[in-house]
Amino acid sequence: DSEEDEEHTIITDTELPPLKLMHSFCAFKADDGPCKAIMKRFFFNIFTRQCEEFIYGGCEGNQNRFESLEECKKMCTRDNANRIIKTTLQQEKPDFCFLEEDPGICRGYITRYFYNNQTKQCERFKYGGCLGNMNNFETLEECKNICEDGPNGFQVDNYGTQLNAVNNSLTPQSTKVPSLFEFHGPSWCLTPADRGLCRANENRFYYNSVIGKCRPFKYSGCGGNENNFTSKQECLRACKKGFIQRISKGGLIKTKRKRKKQRVKIAYEEIFVKNM
């Protein structure tokens, strides 16, 4: 497979703080698309953490493509004043930790976690699937790492942010060095088809990880899980062809293990929830 051939070994070198993405598409590779036009566009490079120029072919591609440098910066970089990244060990909680839990105006029965400022703990709540606010985490661990105090009142913040799969809010995603190199693609591709709790009968596709194929199922209209696609093509793109989207150009990131350079392979998952 040519995807495999493109996989590069990356020498780690310069130290960078954990990458915090404003939108998941900012992590996509620059994609010139199949057409042959020569159009100057800009994309966000997750290695250099800068917006850079590339040549776009004029069709298809992905959302990591901007008409101007300014637009790219606006969508994919944060000015220093708004950064969640802290340079000191004693870190403040991000403002969104103090928002009350908000299920949102939809009703999808999704288990999420929020930081309860009264109890000073992360707690479970039922999220509806749209809107709401940023105090909304997919796992208890993510919530704790972002919003709960660590030992001695220190804030633990080894986490980056990625776009929440359901409501355009920034949801913390671990970028601790060990896990950075252990992504295995969208986890929802491994989940069974889930009809959900409502009464509609919508034609959908899910990825059957046992047989490695996309299969149709009837969706009830709410609830369920992320293994749910409106077309077979979208299902295959997310779960089969793009199960792990390999990075095809070298980048320099430092790991701190044993104080020596290490040869590592980086893979990151391409997230199709925000086409996102």
Partner: antibody
Amino acid sequence: QVQLQQSGPGLVKPSQTLSLTCAISGDSVSSDSAAWSWIRQSPGRGLEWLGIIYKRSKWYNRYAVSVKSRITINPDTSKNQFSLQLNSVTPEDTAVYYCARWDSDKHWGFDYWGQGTLVTVSS
Amino acid sequence: DIVMTQSPLSLPVTPGEPASISCRSSQSLVISRGNTYLNWYLQKPGQSPQLLIYKGSNRASGVPDRFSGSGSGTDFTLKISRVEAEDVGVYYCQQYDSYPLTFGQGTKVEIK
């Protein structure tokens, strides 16, 4: 069949408070499968969402930033209705005001609308 | 705020012919569980808006199958396979990806 019946004055003086009510039949304002919103329409602005309330484990509201300092949307569970209050109005607030139900279960959209109330702000 | 931009603003149509309305969002809209966070409404003359297409591509109850919604990312389309006289009015797209909920400026469909 859900019905939304709007009531309230059609003429409001500048700097005064615009008050409208939306009476619900066929559903409950406290339903956890709906949310209740006010939207206005004017030639200059088109359809403009103003705010929404919804009951889950407790009451929540969200308002458009453009009117946040002036708007209140309240439920009245005893009368099964909800209201809009917009303070310190100016001629810019002249519009047709609609109440609408957001279907939280199936549609995830405004599936029922009131008949609309033309509110003119003028002295 | 996410700005929704529709085109054309006016669409003269011939009954029996197809029609297409475009809606572009200033930011990519969420696709989750196969749903796009975008709805389409039709406001017939002298009436309140009515829900036409929800979650990007699903027809609301009572909506004829000549109406279809499609698109993802920032580009969305409402298609009428064969326009009928009763389809005249103003069509609006609306996003619920993030607050504030925003509508397109509307496309007025009228019979030629």
